[in-house]
């Protein structure tokens, strides 16, 4: 828990350089995000494909979309879970991180020093050991997050099932209802290829309790979709006399010394002129 209050931002006096004053873990061990580069990667043949159970959410069900002042968050049902880790990890929410229209490079994880346009996090908690995400969040093996790197490209109808509701959650504290859809559609091709490491929440309180799975392949959203994400939301309440745009809501990469990131794939990805790999 924070030493005093829960005010934190991505910019200004309460920005990430100050997080550790109120949230000591933010200055501690196993911090995320990180840069994924070749000299820290090690292939691990035991990293088998994950199975995504209960990800196909019925449109007859309503799911709460919230502007929490830091991101836009979609609540997920507890019977949605990942199979293939040491315990069952049940879903709790998903949210995004992004940059701004002038610098649309707001992913949290980077690959060989390069940012992607944005990043999706699907947060799960260890439901074999803990009753809810809140309890699990500061416990060992408590959380597992799937991270999807997002690049600018073609229009993505699946992501639009979230983006089309942004106008109803423009300000902090606002909530809207989203029809269920297949969350697996938000994942990239070849989900069997991923990076795996032990890290932390990328937001305060930065608990070092996250098993990270970062998918190797990005998904695409259109320039218009990215712009909508970058311009639709505010960090402040509707009646705030000093509105603040919700932009650049990503943490800088953290030092990652004397540790390894494990990959489910062997690193070489050669493309010939014919497009074969």
């Amino acid at each position: 828990a924070p030493v005093n209050g829960s005010k934190w931002t991505y910019f200004g006096p309460d920005g990430e350089n100050s997080w550790s004053k109120k949230y000591p873990s933010c200055g501690g061990l196993l911090q995320s995000p990180i840069d994924l580069h070749s000299d820290i990667l090690q292939y691990d043949a035991s990293l088998t494909p994950l199975e995504f159970q209960g990800y196909n959410l019925s449109a007859n069900k309503q799911f709460l979309l919230t502007n929490n002042g830091h991101s836009v968050k979609l609540n997920l049902p507890s019977d949605m879970h990942i199979q293939g880790l040491q315990s069952r990890y049940s879903a709790t929410q998903l949210h995004l991180h992004w940059g701004n229209p002038n610098d649309p490079h707001g992913s949290e994880h980077t690959v060989s020093g390069q940012h992607f346009a944005a990043e999706l996090h699907i947060v799960h908690y260890n439901s074999d050991l803990y009753p809810d995400a809140s309890t699990a969040s500061n416990k060992s093996e408590g959380l597992a997050v799937l991270a999807v790197l997002i690049e600018m490209g073609s229009f993505n109808p699946s992501y639009d099932k979230i983006f089309s509701h942004l106008q109803h959650v423009k300000y902090k504290g606002q909530e809207a209802f989203v029809p269920g859809f297949n969350i697996e559609e938000l994942l990239p091709e070849r989900t069997a290829e991923y990076y795996r490491y032990r890290g932390s929440l990328t937001t305060p309180p930065c608990n070092p309790t996250v098993l990270w799975t970062v998918f190797r392949n990005p998904v695409q959203i259109s320039q218009e979709q990215l712009l909508a994400l970058e311009t639709a939301l505010y960090c402040t309440h509707m009646d705030d006399p000093s509105p603040r745009e919700m932009i650049n809501n990503f943490r800088q990469v953290q030092k990652f010394d004397e540790r390894l990131v494990y990959t489910s794939f062997s690193q070489v990805q050669v493309c010939t002129a014919a497009g074969l790999s």
């Epitope: 007859n60 069900k61 309503q62 507890s78 109803h168 809207a176 209802f177």
Partner: antibody, heavy 121, light 106 residues
């Protein structure tokens, strides 16, 4: 025939609590959320909260958070509304209802008959 | 919260009259739904997604509108139409209803 039937209403003392039931039949119970909506005498409709019978996940109108608890017994196809610290303003007909998706959002296609709760000493 | 204001709150009309009920939302909503309620009964779904009549609802009813202003219109009022009508939005949490418009016999 799809049906929702509420029960458990009656006279309750101020400060007391109520537990209402909503029994469903005629459809696959876990496929739809169950909502509780109330209507004070001569007044409009007010949403209390809902439950997903498949997993017990609940969402509440902020106004009732901490005072209302919705639960479910899947084996009985029945949802429950428990409300505590009742006051005179909680006097209302309480309905359960089921929303159906039509291609963009939902509307309440099935309603129970309602059960009257009167809070009075 | 999105406040829903219906007007008028009640109206008296005769059989055969054209009746218009308005619902104004305090913020923009995507769609509006309408329910009919008769005394001592549960509400019935009447119009969904602003303009679509629920199966069995007579074609003299219609709905229209967008953004913050929506209307329910009865082209030729019939005896069975005397009831209270409620609008409802589902765009934002909490979902909210209008206070109702009571259509009475003149």
């Amino acid at each position: 025939e799809v049906q929702l039937v509420e029960s458990g209403g009656g006279l309750v003392q101020p400060g007391g609590s109520l537990r209402l039931s909503c029994a469903a039949s005629g459809y696959s119970y876990t496929d739809y959320n169950i909502y509780w909506v109330r209507q004070a005498p001569g007044k409009g409709l007010e949403w209390v909260g809902y439950i997903d019978p498949a997993n017990g996940d609940t969402t509440y109108n902020q106004k009732f958070k901490g005072r209302a608890t919705i639960s479910v017994d899947k084996s009985k196809n029945t949802a429950y509304l428990q409300m505590n610290s009742l006051r005179a303003e909680d006097t209302a007909v309480y309905y359960c209802s089921r929303p159906i998706y039509y291609g963009a959002y939902w509307y309440f296609d099935v309603w129970g008959q309602g059960t009257l709760v009167t809070v009075s000493s | 919260d999105i406040q829903m204001t219906q007007s008028p709150s009640s109206l008296s009309a005769s059989v055969g009259d054209r009746v218009t009920i308005t619902c104004r939302a305090s913020s923009s909503v995507t769609y509006m739904h309408w329910y009919q309620q008769k005394p001592g009964k549960a509400p019935k779904p009447w119009i969904y997604a602003t303009s679509h009549l629920v199966s069995g609802v007579p074609s003299r009813f219609s709905g229209s509108g967008s953004g913050t202003d929506f209307t329910l219109t009865i082209s030729s009022l019939q005896p069975e139409d005397f009831a209270t009508y409620y609008c409802q939005q589902w765009s934002s949490n909490p979902l909210t209803f209008g206070q109702g418009t009571k259509v009475e016999i003149k």
